[in-house]
Interface confidence: medium
Amino acid sequence: DASGDLLNTEAHSAPAQRWSMQVPAEVNAEAGDAAVLPCTFTHPHRHYDGPLTAIWRSGEPYAGPQVFRCTAAPGSELCQTALSLHGRFRLLGNPRRNDLSLRVERLALADSGRYFCRVEFTGDAHDRYESRHGVRLRVTAAAPRIVNISVLPGPAHAFRALCTAEGEPPPALAWSGPAPGNSSAALQGQGHGYQVTAELPALTRDGRYTCTAANSLGRAEASVYLFRFHGAP
């Protein structure tokens, strides 16, 4: 196998087509991104097309909490999702092709840890197998990045500014601009996972408004300009 010592191969039973599971030792990804947790297996039940269940759990094998589960009916390629923790887990592989690879969306630092894949044949060939070593998911922190900055019409012919940034840990946002004191307090908006939004509710003067996002890994800045057309004197 070309993936060398990154791979854990677990097997038991007789030679020929035995139960075995292949998972990489470690997968690295950045917070906010998606990660693929690969898992493939072989089994002794030739051409099995009965009902099956694919399971992923976290923490420890056999007993850790399930984060994903799907079931496929006899003769069906469709593995219907029965559990996807926070809706962020989905099967990337095809269990009928001995592939249980899982995709994890919108990673957070708290997702770091070990994950274990398991397959259960629940038909005549009643059998199951689970990865003992699992795959270690390492989620690394992400420096701030401003994903959107804009000026929008506000109440009473005024304007307001919005700044959305992402990072892990979630960055703190601050606005600065041409108002007296050259700085304005931002109303911290709703944070969605690793994204945060701050609003500057009233832009009182023309000029440059700068949004700064900062966390323990760094800072990012973006600016927007407001120029209103004033009628001739």
């Epitope: 196998d1 070309a2 993936s3 990154l6 791979l7 191969t9 075995s20 292949q22 990489p24 997968v27 693929v36 690969p38 493939t40 297996f41 072989t42 051409h47 097309d49 009916a73 003769g75 069906s76 390629e77 469709l78 099967l91 990337l92 592989g93 095809n94 009928r96 092709r97 001995n98 592939d99 690879s101 995709r103």
Partner: antibody, heavy 117, light 108 residues
Amino acid sequence: QVQLVESGGGLVQPGGSLRLSCAASGFTFTNYAMNWVRQAPGKGLEWVSYISYSSSNTYYADSVKGRFTISRDNSKNTLYLQMNSLRAEDTAVYYCARGAGLGYDVWGQGTLVTVSS
Amino acid sequence: DIELTQPPSVSVAPGQTARISCSGDNLRSKYVYWYQQKPGQAPVLVIYDTNDRPSGIPERFSGSNSGNTATLTISGTQAEDEADYYCQTYDMTSQDVFGGGTKLTVLG
């Protein structure tokens, strides 16, 4: 950016051999199953072969079984297709494609294989 | 082995809805994928898992599956949608299967 680049195509006589390569970049190659798909001139797509991320599972279309061998070198981020006992009907553009259960989401630009005497 | 059957060609006026069918035994119990291929280019995945759209694919592309027939629907068809479209699924024998392809012509 995510990219697949095939190479190794060319003109070969019936009964001859050829090895195609597919260099992957811009993504973690070791995490993904890979496939070869071919398209004869003016015809539709035909799946040729599949290999799991760890090389533990390989599958072939009936039309190439016993003649073609799929493999991968994860240390080189490269997918291969060894084609032996080539026939005129193997003439096609050969694409490598990333993917398994969510479809083939990344394709190479293809390499032309012509089998003719 | 499963066989997927598509109409060889479908024509549609700009702005109208195009529907491309793909039929096969027991297709309702399988995931279906759709690919768009323009002349001289590699195919592009436009629908996966029967009705999901990859990022970057316009919302006018959608998929459905009823009985033994899967359908790719393009609403508000544009000239740039003119291409060949292929459906694909997996077979129990671990074979991947493509339909024969449908040439979509946008009139005008």
